[in-house]
């Protein structure tokens, strides 16, 4: 479906102003920050979805071990530049001409640089480990009924092909999630799983970013799964490239 | 639009099995569950149970050993079946919508049927 | 099993007065990573289903009037009717859905 005809609103997308004005009078909705006009059908981008936010007002053995070229976000929240189709620019620049290369994700994969830092391509990040601990239970969740449920909140709710989510670890009380998609695997109108991913991280944060009743409210049989610690791991098609003194 | 109907025989005798249907229209039986309340007369609600989206059911503890929930997708049908009933299980019945992931609230309710255990 | 406990049974307000209705549960409703309450507030008319009002303790839901207001985290929960209307006549229940779910005993909302 696209924008909500009745109020128009984008169920996919909070941060959006919407109006009335397109083809015909249907519903169109421009994303916060950008302006752009999102298709309310589907996941609004990440670089979107970021801009949005700066814009807006301020107020062991079955588990994986990240790979050693593992990103995480540490740098955490900037003002980014999108391209038109709402992906990263490979290289993002802040208001003191400090620049550097980011993935698809938006996460930096360089040392910082000035403005003569050259990103030659934006790098996809094909694998995603989402790492969350839960508050305890009264015992462990069952790992297949855990494992159903949580690939179907990808399916249903992000939109997420099935075959993309590759695994669904779970050693009490931490499970894991993992993500493939390579870029010959996606297919024109494949949700991306970066952006899955954000969604997901917003969802259990309980900033949601669908419109409605505002949070996630995840069950495995019945009983609520309350994530108290989540981490993102995400590993690039090519490795990133810092300097050793980072690495110290 | 979304739709939930319940249906079922008005009079039950005592000892018999309250049988009941839920017939949903407007949402996949796939991506949201059902669930059953019900109200004697001139009381409150009590929840009875539960089958969500991905099949699995919970039940109110004071009525599991009597209580089955089912439901047949190809009829957009749930079922709900107490066994052993008494003049106490008399109340309107009322099956209502699981909101998924939005959070197990009941936004939309069919308009109930009255079920009377008398013999 | 989660108790929750309706106070007052029944309440008499005039038109344009403030009516509260308080709501315990036996257990927080909390849920610590997303620090939202596991709490909805029905309506309920005679001869008509409930009908939700708000939900994760403090949400309106769409349509409803914003004279309804909820309050509370943890155990303490409150919905208000800022100035009553005479269509607000009705029974008001609380539901908890942090272990399953339990409704509160109701109160009645009355006219003076």
């Known amino acids: 479906h696209t924008a909500a005809q009745d109020n128009c609103t984008c169920p996919t997308n909070k941060m959006t102003v919407c109006s009335p004005d397109g083809p015909g009078g249907r519903c169109q909705c421009r994303a916060l920050g950008s302006g752009v006009a999102v298709d309310c059908s589907t996941l609004t981008s990440e670089c979107l979805l970021l801009k949005a936010r700066m814009s807006a007002p301020k107020n062991a053995r079955t588990l994986v071990r990240p790979n050693e070229h593992a990103l995480v976000d540490n740098d955490g929240l900037y003002d980014p530049d999108c391209d038109p189709e709402g992906r990263f620019k490979a290289r993002q620049c802040n208001q003191t001409s400090v620049c550097w290369c980011v993935n698809s994700v938006g996460v930096r994969r360089t040392d910082k640089g000035d403005l003569s830092l050259r990103c030659d391509e934006l790098v996809r990040t094909h694998h995603i480990l989402i790492d969350l601990r839960h508050r305890p239970t009264a015992g462990a969740f069952n790992h297949s009924d855990l494992d159903a449920e949580l690939r179907r909140l990808f399916r249903e709710r992000y939109r997420l092909h099935p075959k993309f989510v590759a695994a669904v670890h779970y050693e009490q009380p931490t499970i894991q999630i993992e993500l493939r998609q390579n870029t010959s695997q996606k297919a024109a109108g494949d949700v991306d799983i970066g952006d899955a991913a954000y969604y997901f991280e917003r969802d259990v944060k309980g900033e949601s970013l669908f419109q409605g009743r505002g949070g996630l409210d995840l069950r495995v049989r019945g009983e609520p799964l309350q994530v108290e610690r989540t981490l993102i791991y995400y590993l690039d098609e090519i490795p990133p490239k810092f300097s050793m003194k980072r690495l110290t | 639009q979304v739709q939930l109907q319940e249906s079922g025989p008005g009079l039950v005798k005592p000892s018999e099995t309250l049988s009941l249907t839920c017939t949903v229209s407007g949402f996949s039986l796939t991506s949201y569950g059902v669930n059953w309340i019900r109200q004697p007369p001139g009381k409150g609600l009590e929840w009875i149970g539960v089958m969500w989206a991905g099949g699995s059911t919970n039940y109110n503890s004071a009525l599991m050993s009597r209580l089955t929930i089912s439901k047949d997708t190809s009829k957009n049908q749930f079922s709900l079946k107490l066994s052993s009933v008494t003049a106490a299980d008399t109340a309107v019945y009322y099956c209502?919508?699981?909101?998924?992931?939005?959070?197990?609230?009941?936004?939309?309710w069919g308009q109930g049927t009255l079920v009377t255990v008398s013999s | 099993d989660i108790v929750m406990t309706q106070s007052p049974d029944s309440l008499a307000v005039s038109l344009g007065e403030r009516a509260t209705i308080n709501c315990k549960s036996s257990?927080?409703?909390?849920?610590?990573?997303?620090?939202?309450?596991?709490l909805a507030w029905y309506q309920q008319k005679p001869g008509q289903p409930p009908k939700l009002l708000i939900s994760?303790?403090?949400s309106r839901e769409s349509g409803v009037p914003d004279r309804f207001s909820g309050s509370g985290s943890g155990t303490d929960f409150t919905l208000t009717i800022s100035s009553l209307q005479a269509e607000d006549v009705a029974v008001y229940y609380c539901k908890q859905s942090y272990n399953l779910f339990t409704f509160g005993g109701g109160t009645k909302v009355e006219i003076k």
């Open positions: 257990q927080s409703l909390l849920n610590s990573g997303t620090r939202k309450n596991y």
């Open positions: 994760w303790a403090s």
């Open positions: 209502a919508r699981d909101e998924n992931w939005d959070g197990a609230w009941f936004a939309y």
